[in-house]
Protein backbone atom coordinates (compact mmCIF):
# COMPACT_ATOMS: atom_id res chain seq x y z
CA UNK A 1 0.00 0.00 0.00
CA UNK A 2 1.31 3.44 -0.95
CA UNK A 3 1.41 5.55 2.20
CA UNK A 4 4.09 8.06 1.30
CA UNK A 5 3.78 11.71 0.36
CA UNK A 6 6.05 13.91 -1.73
CA UNK A 7 6.78 17.44 -0.61
CA UNK A 8 8.09 19.71 -3.37
CA UNK A 9 9.21 23.30 -3.76
CA UNK A 10 5.85 23.91 -5.43
CA UNK A 11 5.35 26.85 -7.79
CA UNK A 12 8.61 28.72 -8.16
CA UNK A 13 10.01 31.49 -10.31
CA UNK A 14 13.52 32.48 -11.30
CA UNK A 15 15.28 35.03 -13.48
CA UNK A 16 16.37 34.41 -17.04
CA UNK A 17 20.10 33.54 -17.08
CA UNK A 18 20.03 32.47 -13.44
CA UNK A 19 19.76 29.05 -11.82
CA UNK A 20 17.21 27.24 -9.67
CA UNK A 21 17.18 24.17 -7.45
CA UNK A 22 14.33 21.70 -7.90
CA UNK A 23 13.74 19.73 -4.72
CA UNK A 24 11.43 16.88 -3.73
CA UNK A 25 11.26 14.92 -0.50
CA UNK A 26 9.51 11.60 0.05
CA UNK A 27 8.17 11.01 3.54
CA UNK A 28 5.72 8.84 5.52
CA UNK A 29 6.92 5.57 4.02
CA UNK A 30 9.60 3.01 4.81
CA UNK A 31 9.85 2.06 1.13
CA UNK A 32 13.33 1.77 -0.35
CA UNK A 33 14.09 4.42 -2.97
CA UNK A 34 15.77 2.65 -5.87
CA UNK A 35 15.78 5.51 -8.37
CA UNK A 36 14.63 9.10 -8.78
CA UNK A 37 13.83 10.42 -12.26
CA UNK A 38 13.63 14.12 -13.04
CA UNK A 39 11.42 14.84 -16.04
CA UNK A 40 10.12 17.86 -17.92
CA UNK A 41 6.87 16.92 -19.64
CA UNK A 42 7.87 13.56 -21.16
CA UNK A 43 11.57 14.38 -21.45
CA UNK A 44 13.99 12.71 -19.07
CA UNK A 45 16.41 15.26 -17.61
CA UNK A 46 18.30 13.13 -15.13
CA UNK A 47 18.32 9.94 -13.10
CA UNK A 48 19.70 9.29 -9.64
CA UNK A 49 20.05 5.53 -9.22
CA UNK A 50 20.75 3.88 -5.86
CA UNK A 51 23.45 1.64 -7.39
CA UNK A 52 24.85 3.85 -10.16
CA UNK A 53 24.49 7.39 -8.88
CA UNK A 54 23.65 10.24 -11.25
CA UNK A 55 23.09 10.14 -14.99
CA UNK A 56 22.29 13.40 -16.79
CA UNK A 57 20.62 13.11 -20.21
CA UNK A 58 23.17 14.14 -22.88
CA UNK A 59 20.96 16.92 -24.27
CA UNK A 60 20.86 18.59 -20.83
CA UNK A 61 24.46 18.03 -19.71
CA UNK A 62 25.47 21.68 -20.17
CA UNK A 63 22.65 23.16 -18.12
CA UNK A 64 21.71 20.56 -15.52
CA UNK A 65 23.73 19.68 -12.43
CA UNK A 66 23.01 16.89 -9.95
CA UNK A 67 22.00 17.75 -6.41
CA UNK A 68 21.88 18.93 -3.80
CA UNK A 69 20.84 15.52 -2.49
CA UNK A 70 18.24 14.00 -4.77
CA UNK A 71 17.40 17.46 -6.12
CA UNK A 72 18.39 18.97 -9.44
CA UNK A 73 19.96 22.31 -10.32
CA UNK A 74 18.96 24.02 -13.58
CA UNK A 75 21.41 26.61 -14.85
CA UNK A 76 21.48 29.33 -17.54
CA UNK A 77 17.71 29.51 -17.48
CA UNK A 78 15.77 30.66 -20.53
CA UNK A 79 12.11 31.58 -20.90
CA UNK A 80 11.67 28.24 -22.68
CA UNK A 81 12.44 26.48 -19.39
CA UNK A 82 9.10 27.68 -18.03
CA UNK A 83 6.81 24.71 -17.39
CA UNK A 84 6.13 21.63 -15.31
CA UNK A 85 8.89 19.48 -13.81
CA UNK A 86 8.35 16.12 -12.18
CA UNK A 87 10.31 14.09 -9.68
CA UNK A 88 9.43 10.42 -9.95
CA UNK A 89 10.49 8.25 -7.03
CA UNK A 90 10.75 4.55 -7.87
CA UNK A 91 10.46 2.65 -4.61
CA UNK A 92 10.09 -0.90 -3.34
CA UNK A 93 7.60 -2.19 -2.40
CA UNK A 94 5.37 0.86 -2.82
CA UNK A 95 6.11 1.61 -6.47
CA UNK A 96 6.00 5.04 -8.10
CA UNK A 97 5.52 8.41 -6.37
CA UNK A 98 5.34 11.60 -8.42
CA UNK A 99 5.88 15.21 -7.35
CA UNK A 100 5.16 18.25 -9.52
CA UNK A 101 6.95 21.60 -9.63
CA UNK A 102 5.94 24.51 -11.84
CA UNK A 103 8.80 26.80 -12.81
CA UNK A 104 8.28 30.23 -14.32
CA UNK A 105 11.34 31.91 -15.80
CA UNK A 106 10.95 35.70 -15.71
CA UNK A 107 12.62 38.42 -17.76
CA UNK A 108 12.49 40.86 -14.85
CA UNK A 109 14.29 40.74 -11.51
CA UNK A 110 11.10 40.21 -9.51
CA UNK A 111 11.35 36.42 -9.22
CA UNK A 112 10.05 35.05 -5.93
CA UNK A 113 9.87 31.60 -4.47
CA UNK A 114 6.39 30.14 -3.93
CA UNK A 115 5.16 28.29 -0.86
CA UNK A 116 5.70 24.59 -0.33
CA UNK A 117 2.83 22.21 -0.89
CA UNK A 118 2.22 18.48 -0.65
CA UNK A 119 1.10 15.90 -3.18
CA UNK A 120 -0.34 12.67 -1.74
Amino acid sequence: MMTGTIETTGNISAEKGGSIILQCHLSSTTAQVTQVNWEQQDQLLAICNADLGWHISPSFKDRVAPGPGLGLTLQSLTVNDTGEYFCIYHTYPDGTYTGRIFLEVLESSVAEHGARFQIP
Epitope: T34, N37, N49, A50, D51, Y92, T96
Partner: antibody, heavy 119, light 107 residues
Framework: EVQLVESGGGLVKPGGSLKLSCAAS????????MSWVRQSPEKRLEWVAE????????YFPDTVTGRFTISRDNAKNTLYLEMSSLRSEDTAMYYC????????????WGQGTSVTVSS | DVQITQSPSYLAASPGETITINCRAS??????LAWYQEKPGKTNKLLIY???TLQSGIPSRFSGSGSGTDFTLTISSLEPEDFAVYYC?????????FGGGTKLEIK
Protein backbone atom coordinates in the same frame (compact mmCIF):
# COMPACT_ATOMS: atom_id res chain seq x y z
CA GLU B 1 21.95 -5.64 -31.03
CA VAL B 2 20.54 -6.39 -27.56
CA GLN B 3 20.35 -10.13 -26.92
CA LEU B 4 19.17 -12.10 -23.91
CA VAL B 5 19.55 -15.88 -23.99
CA GLU B 6 18.08 -18.01 -21.21
CA SER B 7 19.20 -21.54 -20.33
CA GLY B 8 18.96 -24.08 -17.52
CA GLY B 9 15.31 -25.08 -17.79
CA GLY B 10 14.13 -28.67 -17.64
CA LEU B 11 11.99 -31.23 -15.85
CA VAL B 12 12.20 -31.27 -12.06
CA LYS B 13 10.28 -33.08 -9.33
CA PRO B 14 8.13 -31.17 -6.80
CA GLY B 15 10.35 -29.91 -3.97
CA GLY B 16 13.36 -29.88 -6.28
CA SER B 17 15.66 -27.04 -7.34
CA LEU B 18 16.83 -25.48 -10.57
CA LYS B 19 19.12 -22.62 -11.54
CA LEU B 20 18.34 -20.58 -14.66
CA SER B 21 20.86 -18.38 -16.45
CA CYS B 22 20.46 -15.47 -18.84
CA ALA B 23 23.43 -14.41 -20.96
CA ALA B 24 23.24 -10.75 -22.00
CA SER B 25 25.01 -9.06 -24.88
CA UNK B 26 24.80 -5.95 -27.03
CA UNK B 27 24.50 -3.46 -24.15
CA UNK B 28 26.26 -2.40 -20.96
CA UNK B 29 24.72 -5.05 -18.70
CA UNK B 30 25.99 -3.52 -15.46
CA UNK B 31 23.93 -0.34 -15.95
CA UNK B 32 20.50 -1.97 -16.22
CA UNK B 33 18.12 -3.49 -13.69
CA MET B 34 16.92 -6.92 -14.82
CA SER B 35 13.80 -9.02 -14.26
CA TRP B 36 12.51 -12.54 -14.62
CA VAL B 37 8.96 -13.02 -15.91
CA ARG B 38 7.22 -16.35 -16.38
CA GLN B 39 4.39 -17.49 -18.62
CA SER B 40 2.17 -20.33 -17.44
CA PRO B 41 0.88 -23.05 -19.77
CA GLU B 42 -2.39 -21.04 -19.77
CA LYS B 43 -0.36 -18.13 -21.21
CA ARG B 44 -0.68 -15.86 -18.17
CA LEU B 45 2.36 -13.65 -17.51
CA GLU B 46 3.70 -13.19 -13.99
CA TRP B 47 6.64 -11.08 -12.82
CA VAL B 48 8.78 -13.21 -10.48
CA ALA B 49 11.97 -11.32 -9.65
CA GLU B 50 13.96 -8.15 -10.16
CA UNK B 51 17.50 -7.08 -9.39
CA UNK B 52 19.07 -3.64 -9.46
CA UNK B 53 21.96 -2.83 -11.80
CA UNK B 54 24.66 -3.41 -9.21
CA UNK B 55 22.88 -6.33 -7.56
CA UNK B 56 22.33 -4.42 -4.32
CA UNK B 57 18.54 -4.68 -4.35
CA UNK B 58 16.36 -7.69 -5.12
CA TYR B 59 12.56 -7.86 -5.26
CA PHE B 60 10.05 -10.70 -5.44
CA PRO B 61 6.28 -11.19 -5.35
CA ASP B 62 4.83 -13.09 -2.38
CA THR B 63 4.28 -16.20 -4.53
CA VAL B 64 8.03 -16.91 -4.74
CA THR B 65 9.53 -15.03 -1.76
CA GLY B 66 11.78 -17.35 0.24
CA ARG B 67 11.95 -19.91 -2.56
CA PHE B 68 13.52 -17.95 -5.43
CA THR B 69 16.78 -16.01 -5.47
CA ILE B 70 17.88 -13.61 -8.19
CA SER B 71 21.53 -12.70 -8.67
CA ARG B 72 23.87 -11.35 -11.34
CA ASP B 73 27.50 -11.47 -12.34
CA ASN B 74 28.26 -8.19 -14.09
CA ALA B 75 31.74 -9.38 -15.05
CA LYS B 76 30.17 -12.28 -16.96
CA ASN B 77 27.13 -10.32 -18.22
CA THR B 78 24.91 -13.01 -16.75
CA LEU B 79 21.68 -12.99 -14.76
CA TYR B 80 20.58 -15.95 -12.61
CA LEU B 81 17.39 -17.25 -11.04
CA GLU B 82 17.79 -19.93 -8.41
CA MET B 83 14.56 -21.76 -7.67
CA SER B 84 14.01 -24.17 -4.77
CA SER B 85 11.04 -25.95 -3.16
CA LEU B 86 9.50 -26.03 -6.62
CA ARG B 87 5.77 -26.63 -7.00
CA SER B 88 3.64 -27.72 -9.94
CA GLU B 89 2.35 -24.14 -10.24
CA ASP B 90 5.91 -23.00 -11.00
CA THR B 91 5.67 -24.83 -14.34
CA ALA B 92 6.13 -22.14 -16.96
CA MET B 93 8.31 -20.59 -19.63
CA TYR B 94 10.80 -18.30 -17.85
CA TYR B 95 11.97 -15.12 -19.57
CA CYS B 96 14.66 -12.68 -18.54
CA UNK B 97 13.99 -9.07 -19.43
CA UNK B 98 15.86 -5.79 -19.28
CA UNK B 99 14.25 -2.92 -17.43
CA UNK B 100 14.32 0.44 -19.22
CA UNK B 101 16.98 2.81 -17.91
CA UNK B 102 14.23 5.16 -16.71
CA UNK B 103 12.62 2.20 -14.89
CA UNK B 104 9.46 2.31 -17.02
CA UNK B 105 8.64 -1.21 -18.22
CA UNK B 106 10.83 -3.95 -19.77
CA UNK B 107 12.24 -3.09 -23.17
CA UNK B 108 14.01 -6.31 -24.22
CA TRP B 109 13.07 -9.93 -23.52
CA GLY B 110 14.76 -13.25 -24.15
CA GLN B 111 13.26 -16.27 -25.97
CA GLY B 112 12.65 -18.09 -22.67
CA THR B 113 13.56 -21.41 -21.09
CA SER B 114 10.96 -24.01 -20.14
CA VAL B 115 10.57 -25.31 -16.58
CA THR B 116 8.29 -28.27 -15.83
CA VAL B 117 7.63 -29.33 -12.25
CA SER B 118 6.11 -32.80 -12.22
CA SER B 119 6.54 -36.15 -10.49
CA ASP C 1 -1.98 -6.53 -5.72
CA VAL C 2 -3.30 -4.51 -8.64
CA GLN C 3 -5.54 -6.71 -10.80
CA ILE C 4 -5.53 -5.97 -14.53
CA THR C 5 -8.55 -6.92 -16.62
CA GLN C 6 -7.86 -6.96 -20.34
CA SER C 7 -10.55 -7.10 -23.02
CA PRO C 8 -11.38 -8.56 -25.39
CA SER C 9 -9.44 -11.81 -25.03
CA TYR C 10 -9.94 -12.50 -28.74
CA LEU C 11 -10.32 -10.13 -31.67
CA ALA C 12 -10.64 -10.75 -35.41
CA ALA C 13 -9.95 -7.94 -37.85
CA SER C 14 -8.82 -7.29 -41.40
CA PRO C 15 -5.68 -5.52 -42.62
CA GLY C 16 -6.31 -1.79 -42.91
CA GLU C 17 -8.82 -1.72 -40.04
CA THR C 18 -8.36 0.13 -36.76
CA ILE C 19 -8.74 -1.84 -33.53
CA THR C 20 -8.69 -1.06 -29.81
CA ILE C 21 -7.75 -3.21 -26.83
CA ASN C 22 -8.67 -2.16 -23.29
CA CYS C 23 -7.11 -2.70 -19.89
CA ARG C 24 -8.73 -1.80 -16.59
CA ALA C 25 -6.83 -1.70 -13.29
CA SER C 26 -8.47 -2.57 -9.95
CA UNK C 27 -7.16 0.74 -8.54
CA UNK C 28 -5.50 3.85 -9.92
CA UNK C 29 -2.08 3.23 -11.47
CA UNK C 30 -1.60 6.85 -12.58
CA UNK C 31 -0.23 6.71 -16.16
CA UNK C 32 1.98 3.69 -15.58
CA LEU C 33 0.80 1.05 -18.02
CA ALA C 34 2.86 -0.71 -20.70
CA TRP C 35 1.80 -2.69 -23.78
CA TYR C 36 3.71 -5.66 -25.25
CA GLN C 37 3.41 -7.69 -28.44
CA GLU C 38 4.03 -11.45 -28.44
CA LYS C 39 4.62 -13.36 -31.68
CA PRO C 40 5.65 -17.02 -32.15
CA GLY C 41 9.38 -17.41 -32.64
CA LYS C 42 10.06 -13.77 -31.71
CA THR C 43 10.96 -12.14 -28.41
CA ASN C 44 8.30 -10.03 -26.70
CA LYS C 45 8.32 -6.45 -27.90
CA LEU C 46 7.63 -3.35 -25.81
CA LEU C 47 5.27 -1.07 -27.73
CA ILE C 48 4.09 1.60 -25.29
CA TYR C 49 5.05 2.58 -21.75
CA UNK C 50 3.77 5.17 -19.27
CA UNK C 51 0.36 4.88 -20.88
CA UNK C 52 1.09 6.73 -24.09
CA THR C 53 4.85 6.91 -24.77
CA LEU C 54 5.86 5.06 -27.92
CA GLN C 55 8.93 2.88 -27.51
CA SER C 56 11.76 3.75 -29.89
CA GLY C 57 11.46 1.94 -33.23
CA ILE C 58 7.74 1.18 -32.90
CA PRO C 59 5.56 2.37 -35.82
CA SER C 60 3.29 5.35 -35.14
CA ARG C 61 0.17 3.33 -36.01
CA PHE C 62 0.46 2.04 -32.43
CA SER C 63 -0.82 4.45 -29.79
CA GLY C 64 -1.76 4.27 -26.13
CA SER C 65 -4.09 6.40 -24.06
CA GLY C 66 -5.62 6.52 -20.61
CA SER C 67 -4.72 7.15 -17.00
CA GLY C 68 -6.00 6.14 -13.59
CA THR C 69 -7.78 2.83 -14.13
CA ASP C 70 -8.74 2.74 -17.82
CA PHE C 71 -6.29 2.37 -20.70
CA THR C 72 -6.52 1.68 -24.42
CA LEU C 73 -4.12 0.42 -27.08
CA THR C 74 -5.11 1.50 -30.58
CA ILE C 75 -3.63 0.04 -33.74
CA SER C 76 -4.67 2.04 -36.78
CA SER C 77 -4.52 0.70 -40.33
CA LEU C 78 -3.56 -2.86 -39.35
CA GLU C 79 -0.60 -4.39 -41.15
CA PRO C 80 -0.25 -8.18 -41.67
CA GLU C 81 2.63 -8.28 -39.14
CA ASP C 82 0.38 -6.81 -36.40
CA PHE C 83 -1.59 -10.04 -35.94
CA ALA C 84 -0.25 -11.31 -32.63
CA VAL C 85 -1.02 -11.50 -28.91
CA TYR C 86 -1.00 -8.24 -26.92
CA TYR C 87 -0.50 -7.86 -23.17
CA CYS C 88 -0.74 -4.85 -20.89
CA UNK C 89 1.29 -4.51 -17.68
CA UNK C 90 1.08 -2.02 -14.85
CA UNK C 91 4.42 -0.60 -13.75
CA UNK C 92 3.10 1.65 -11.00
CA UNK C 93 3.50 -0.59 -7.96
CA UNK C 94 4.92 -3.94 -6.92
CA UNK C 95 4.24 -6.65 -7.76
CA UNK C 96 4.13 -5.73 -11.46
CA UNK C 97 1.00 -7.38 -12.89
CA PHE C 98 -0.19 -8.21 -16.41
CA GLY C 99 -3.48 -8.41 -18.22
CA GLY C 100 -4.64 -11.78 -19.54
CA GLY C 101 -3.79 -11.01 -23.15
CA THR C 102 -5.65 -10.32 -26.38
CA LYS C 103 -5.21 -12.56 -29.40
CA LEU C 104 -5.58 -10.51 -32.59
CA GLU C 105 -6.29 -12.71 -35.59
CA ILE C 106 -6.95 -12.08 -39.28
CA LYS C 107 -10.64 -12.09 -40.19
Amino acid sequence: EVQLVESGGGLVKPGGSLKLSCAASGFTFSTYAMSWVRQSPEKRLEWVAEISSGGTYTYFPDTVTGRFTISRDNAKNTLYLEMSSLRSEDTAMYYCARKRRDYYAMDYWGQGTSVTVSS
Amino acid sequence: DVQITQSPSYLAASPGETITINCRASKSISKYLAWYQEKPGKTNKLLIYSGSTLQSGIPSRFSGSGSGTDFTLTISSLEPEDFAVYYCQQHNEYPWTFGGGTKLEIK
